[in-house]
């Protein structure tokens, strides 16, 4: 329950309030704001706007409206140079180039510094070659190429379909498989959905339409020539050869009328199976190379685009708490763009813009939140979570000894199904709880709780009666908050339906129609999709702020420890022989698990009943629960991944967007049958088996009576 | 309203040159592929050149290859027509015509096409 008792204040200044203020109207009005003009990360524009919204913040009523500044590696194409892709004869002459940009929208064709689509750190190069399809790039889709189809990629251009995993990851693949470039295109099968018009008709993405994105592996570090330590004036920088997770191989991204002409023409072996077709009229043929007429005929990348050393800023706002000003709960989302930006991220930052509207109203009527509130506009997220990271390694000791939560706010929707919600366990009963509380925007839903509609439209697969809760992966800034520094964190949004929308993300992004009209006219003209990603965003960060007992329930931790347990076990027990030949036991983890749940209801029960009015007593309870996610870190980070330190939940190894629990001892057992070295292998499972269930042992005794 | 207003047209000797421009309005040319088209004295429609709306890719018939080329400025919303060593067989009306496809990469079909301007190749 929230209350206010400790702040002094009014019983009318509560969660009613604050919630009360949000406007649909003023997040409408923010949106157009913010997506008129492109907003690249270290671009003047972007700094601009930075400065609009510290100077707004302040009005708002802040306490304090910082900027903080790095100087990160960032890429950008040659605006004399352009990147493209040819057909070339085999006289070296090019009968066919890729678009240099795309179609401006209607009444953008007069704007002008919008980059053309570039895949973001690509190194340069012009490698010809054969052209292979890799369907989307990821790990099976190898698999299947090389071991089944004995299909070798070496020294071969591959074109993969975006989707399914993060682009990154396919890059990352198709390097070990031996490429020499990688193009990525947008099949209609995943980016156009059945029965919808195209852009400027409609939410699907026409044929000249491209999505934009950095292709790093950077494994959270941040700034890739500063790895765990933020990029200031007095840094010291790797040389470009020694930075974190830079591709070696030129990539670029083009549209799907280009694709068509690419892949007409393919030769060679046919598509494995259904699952490896898309949807243009092309025989999805892997090749290598094209069939008999043009069999002389190659494809040559040309790629142009530097690496730079930029300043980014972040707006940092705090709105300092009146009884635990020491005590932080952090919202935070991106500001920059790869365009105009119009649904990632200014549809998540004018629901930022409006929360901290409320907030500020609510302070300057005398009420001030039991907690202090950071509010954080991130810059360069897009080039791989630049801003916020840096900012948490600059922060970092504050962070681990204050950091109560982070709620993140990107893109607000990516359809108008339903609500989504990634979290950590410790925040499922404050989103069920709050979305009780707060009425359905849906359709048919009208008098129904956001609970009620939610649950029914994304039940959990597990409990019925509950709405589907997914595990924190990353390709966002709560990255570093969670996977590095063990800081409770979560974040929602207004989801598609995924049962009948199979596409990918949502077809316009990255791409230049991703404009303001694009969210007006068809995802949400009467911005009550976005009201209400801002009630629960907010909601969340308002009870996380000024609960006196703070909202988490560890006993939920508990449930999903078993449910991760049982589930790497199983896994593991596809190989029974070897388990049993190399001694390989989970007792450990399920007595540690099992630990976890007897200590976690205890405390629980200890929760309920403690007295309140004591200050030193209330504080220990609070900082046994904020410190709890902090437990799950092993300092020593996951196998070559320093900074996912986490040990319950990382990025999967395979799709950066995914989240794999247990991690440590999932990577261990994937493929292991492949392994030249079993004994090693299995060594390296029992190793995994051991520091989780340390790991798990070790958070749970955090739990305990503390004498 | 959308429209396509060519000009440059006239009497030329064989072998000089020409240059036909096409001011597009009502639209924006940096979205469309353009095309150029004639039609000679008592003959059908004969298909010229093509570009695509960024100027990434040219087409062009056989018979004009080599002597003709293509061009656009977007941000005077104009195509152009460049004609080297004209020939008798050259005489035609030639329009400019807008590719139907938003973004296309190769021609297609035109939707919207001008009033033509006269090009007469003669000694």
């Known amino acids: 329950k929230s209350s206010n008792e400790a702040t002094n204040i009014t019983p009318k200044h509560n969660m009613k309030a604050f919630l009360d203020e949000l406007k649909a109207e003023n997040i409408k009005k923010f949106l157009y704001n913010f997506t008129q003009i492109p907003h690249l990360a270290g671009t003047e524009q972007n700094f601009q706007l930075a400065k609009q919204i510290q100077s707004q913040w302040k009005e708002f009523g802040l306490d304090s409206v910082e900027l903080a500044h790095y100087d990160v590696l960032l890429s950008y194409p040659n605006k004399t140079h352009p990147n493209y892709i040819s057909i070339i004869n085999e006289d070296g002459n090019e009968i066919f180039n890729t678009s240099l940009f795309e179609p401006p929208p209607p009444g953008y064709e007069n704007v002008s510094d919008i980059v053309p689509p570039f895949s973001a750190f690509s190194p340069q190069g012009m490698p010809e070659g054969d052209l292979v399809y890799v369907n989307y790039a990821r790990t099976e889709d190898f698999f299947k190429l090389e071991r089944d189809m004995k299909i070798n990629c070496s020294g071969k251009i591959v074109i993969a379909r975006y989707g399914k995993v993060f682009r990154g990851n396919k890059v990352k693949n198709a390097q070990l498989a031996g490429a020499k470039g990688v193009i990525l295109y947008s099949d209609p099968a995943d980016y156009f959905a059945p029965g919808v018009k195209s852009y400027p008709d409609g939410w699907n993405l026409p044929g000249g339409g491209v999505q934009r994105g950095n292709i790093l592996n950077l494994n959270g570090a941040g700034d890739p020539l500063t790895p765990g330590y933020p990029a200031n004036e007095y840094a010291y920088r790797r040389g470009i050869a020694e930075a974190v997770g830079l591709p070696s191989i030129p990539v670029h991204p083009i549209g799907y009328y280009d694709a068509q002409k690419l892949l007409e023409k393919m030769g060679g072996s046919a598509p494995p199976d259904s699952s490896w077709r898309g949807s243009l009229k092309v025989p999805y043929n892997v090749g290598p190379g094209f069939t008999g007429n043009f069999s002389t005929q190659k494809v040559k990348m040309h790629i142009h685009s530097t690496n730079e050393v930029t300043r980014i800023y972040n707006v940092i706002g705090t709105l300092r708490g009146a009884v635990e000003p020491d005590r932080y709960v952090i919202l935070g989302g991106h500001r920059d763009s790869w365009v105009f930006g119009g649904i990632d991220p200014q549809s998540g930052a004018a629901v930022v813009h409006e929360i901290v509207r409320s907030f500020g109203t609510l302070k300057k009527e005398g009420w001030r939140p039991r907690r202090t509130i950071l509010f954080a506009s991130w810059d360069a997220e897009e080039f791989g979570l630049l801003g916020s990271t840096e900012w948490a390694e600059e922060n970092s000791r504050l962070l681990q000894e204050r950091g109560v939560a982070y709620i993140n706010a990107d893109s607000s929707i990516e359809g108008n199904y339903t609500l989504r919600v990634d979290c950590t366990p410790l925040m499922y009963s404050l989103v069920h709880n709050l979305t009780k509380e707060l009425k359905s925007p849906d359709e048919g839903f009208e008098g129904k709780s956001l609970y009620e509609s939610w649950t029914k439209k994304s039940p959990s697969p597990e409990f019925s009666g509950m709405p589907r809760i997914s595990k924190l992966g990353s390709g966002n800034d709560f990255e570093v908050f969670f996977q590095r520094l063990g800081i409770a964190s979560g974040r929602a949004r207004y989801t598609k339906n995924w049962e009948t929308n199979k596409f990918s993300g949502y077809p316009l992004y990255h791409s230049v129609y991703e404009t303001y009209e694009l969210v007006e006219k068809f995802y949400d003209p009467m911005f009550k999709y976005h009201l209400t990603v801002a009630q629960v965003r907010g909601g969340m960060v308002f009870e996380l702020a000024n609960s006196i007992v703070l909202p988490f329930d560890c006993r939920d931790y508990a449930v999903v420890l078993r449910k991760y347990a049982d589930k790497i076990y199983s896994i593991s027990m596809k190989h029974p022989q070897e388990m049993k030949t190399y001694s390989v036991s989970f007792d450990s983890l399920f007595s540690a698990v099992k630990n976890f749940t007897e200590i976690a209801s205890k405390f629980s029960e200890r929760l309920q009943d403690f007295d309140k009015s004591n200050p030193i007593v209330l504080r220990m309870m609070n900082d046994q629960l904020m410190f709890l996610e902090r437990a799950f870190i092993d300092p020593l980070g996951l196998p070559d991944r320093p900074f996912y330190r986490h040990v319950i939940y990382a990025p999967s190894s395979h799709n950066k967007y995914a989240g794999e629990s247990f991690p440590g001892i999932y990577d261990a057992l994937f493929d292991i049958e492949s392994k030249v070295d079993p004994s090693k292998a299995w060594g390296e499972v029992k190793r995994q088996i051991y520091v989780a269930a340390f790991t798990v042992q070790a958070a749970a005794e955090t739990l305990s009576e503390v004498a | 309203q959308v429209q396509l207003v060519e000009s440059g047209g006239g009497v030329v000797q064989p072998g000089r040159s020409l240059r036909l421009s096409c001011a597009a309005s009502?639209?924006?040319?940096?979205?469309?592929?353009m095309h150029w088209v004639r039609q000679a004295p008592g003959k059908g429609l004969e298909w010229v050149a093509f570009?695509?709306?960024?100027?990434?890719?040219?087409y062009y018939a056989d018979a004009v290859k080599g002597r003709f080329t293509i061009s656009r400025d977007n941000s005077k919303n104009t195509l152009y027509l460049q004609m080297n060593s004209l020939r008798a067989e050259d005489t035609a009306v030639y329009y400019c015509?807008?590719?139907?496809?938003?973004?296309?990469?190769?021609?297609?079909?035109?939707?919207?096409w001008g009033q033509g301007t006269m090009v007469t190749v003669s000694s």
């Open positions: 015509a807008r590719d139907r496809i938003v973004g296309g990469r190769v021609p297609d079909a035109f939707d919207i």
């Open positions: 009502g639209f924006p040319l940096i979205s469309y592929g």
């Open positions: 570009q695509t709306y960024d100027a990434s890719n040219r």
